[in-house]
Interface confidence: low
């Protein structure tokens, strides 16, 4: 009886999440299996979150808006071992949106999620920031190795979307 | 194959007006920044004008600022230089660009020209 | 405003010869991508981001470089090698050239 009422209370939330995501991927998750983590098919996962990368070409606002629309923000990168996951689905002759801005141009930078700008757990390319004048981050593939660069928002990039994984 | 062909090229007197345009093809036109560069006499390359991919932003260096006016039709896949007050020292041959489609951005393909010379 | 130096403006090489053109930014920059392009025709991509190579440019050729100097390098020297070669920056919002290298045969 209480596996039964789970089912149809997942069912439920699962039709919920349908009006939004045509098809969700889940995993069992939890000490006894019986939590089901799930992403947006086909968005990829790690850890507790979800991520879908967007090929379109658009300016930094744009490119936070389409991952809005989908219920999602640029990605905030919060652990090389996150960045390392990430940068597996990229090509590395490409550049990549980050939810990391600086409005200003005053070297203020901010996640588009309000998570405090944390100097020592960043991934800044050798040089990086070097202008005021751009004020969105990217990640590219430089000198071997993926990091960051600041670039001016208005140019068209590719872009990282980020969200919390549904659970059921 | 991606092709950009630019036309309009001619002989103006100093003071005149000319409008080139630059039709391209086999990409999706609406999905780039374009680009107008010029040729002098001496073989020196200089960027003209850019234009954001929707049309909104224009970008043009201080010598051509106030006479030359870039512009798009994305409907059309064709991109165009308005040049007004013209001096002798615009005789150049000048080229359409397209950037390459990631940053850092390089250009990936040129026009082959078309001539302006500006004399009386 | 960022300034591109190349140097030589004009160099001759013999058949067979190892070739640097030089390019200096008046300040530190972070990539440079170069354009070889032969009489009559348009620039063609030659080397983008610094070492990359455009498509169909043959290995004999290399680019690197980093902060205010980068260069091109030709291994060589081959016959169908003579152009005018130029960098190139795009420091937004401008786009700079370097003067040019008129490269010709010995």
């Known amino acids: 009886n209480f596996m039964y009422s789970k089912t149809v209370k997942r069912l439920s939330k699962l039709q919920e999440y349908q009006q939004y995501y045509p098809s969700l991927t889940c995993v069992m998750e939890g000490k006894d299996m019986e939590d089901w983590s799930c992403c947006p098919t086909p968005w990829t996962s790690f850890q507790s979150s979800c991520y879908f990368i967007s090929t379109v070409m658009q300016s930094w606002t744009k490119s936070q808006n389409n991952c809005s629309v989908m219920g999602a923000d640029l990605v905030v990168i919060n652990t090389k071992e996150e960045q390392d996951f990430i940068t597996q689905n990229l090509k590395i002759n490409s550049a990549y949106f980050l939810g990391l801005s600086d409005p200003k141009g005053w070297r203020h930078w901010q996640w588009v999620d309000q998570t405090p700008y944390n100097k020592n757990v960043t991934f800044w390319h050798s040089g990086e920031p070097n202008s005021p004048d751009e004020r969105c981050a990217i990640i590219n593939f430089r000198s071997e190795e993926w990091g960051w660069n600041d670039v001016h928002c208005h140019v068209p990039q590719k872009s990282i979307c980020k969200m919390k994984k549904i659970y059921i | 194959e991606v092709k950009l062909v630019e036309s309009g090229g001619d002989l103006v007197q100093p003071g005149g007006s000319l409008k080139l345009s630059c039709a391209a093809s086999g990409f999706t036109f609406s999905d780039y920044y374009m680009y107008w560069v010029r040729q002098t006499p001496e073989k020196r390359l200089e960027w003209v004008a850019y234009?954001?991919?929707?049309?909104?932003?224009?970008y043009y260096p201080d010598t051509v600022k106030g006479r030359f006016t870039i512009s798009r039709d994305n409907a059309k896949n064709t991109l165009f230089l308005q040049m007004s007050r013209l001096k002798s020292e615009d005789t150049a041959m000048y080229y359409c660009?397209?950037?390459?489609?990631?940053?850092?951005?390089?250009?990936?393909?040129w026009g082959q020209g078309t001539a302006l010379t500006v004399s009386s | 405003e960022i300034v591109l130096t190349q140097s030589p403006a004009i160099t001759a090489a013999s058949l067979g010869q190892k070739v640097t053109i030089t390019c200096s930014a008046s300040?530190?920059?972070?990539?440079m991508h170069w354009y070889q392009q032969k009489s009559g025709t348009s620039p063609k991509p030659w080397i983008y981001e610094i070492s990359k190579l455009a498509s169909g440019v043959p290995a004999r050729f290399s680019g690197s470089g980093s902060g205010t100097s980068y260069s091109l390098t030709i291994s060589s020297m081959e016959a169908e090698d003579a152009a005018i070669y130029y960098c190139?920056?795009?420091?937004?919002?401008?786009?700079?050239f370097g003067g040019g290298t008129n490269l010709e045969i010995k």
């Open positions: 234009i954001s991919y929707s049309g909104d932003s224009t």
């Open positions: 660009a397209r950037h390459s489609p990631s940053f850092p951005y390089y250009f990936d393909y």
């Open positions: 300040s530190s920059v972070s990539y």
């Open positions: 190139q920056l795009w420091n937004y919002p401008l786009i700079t």
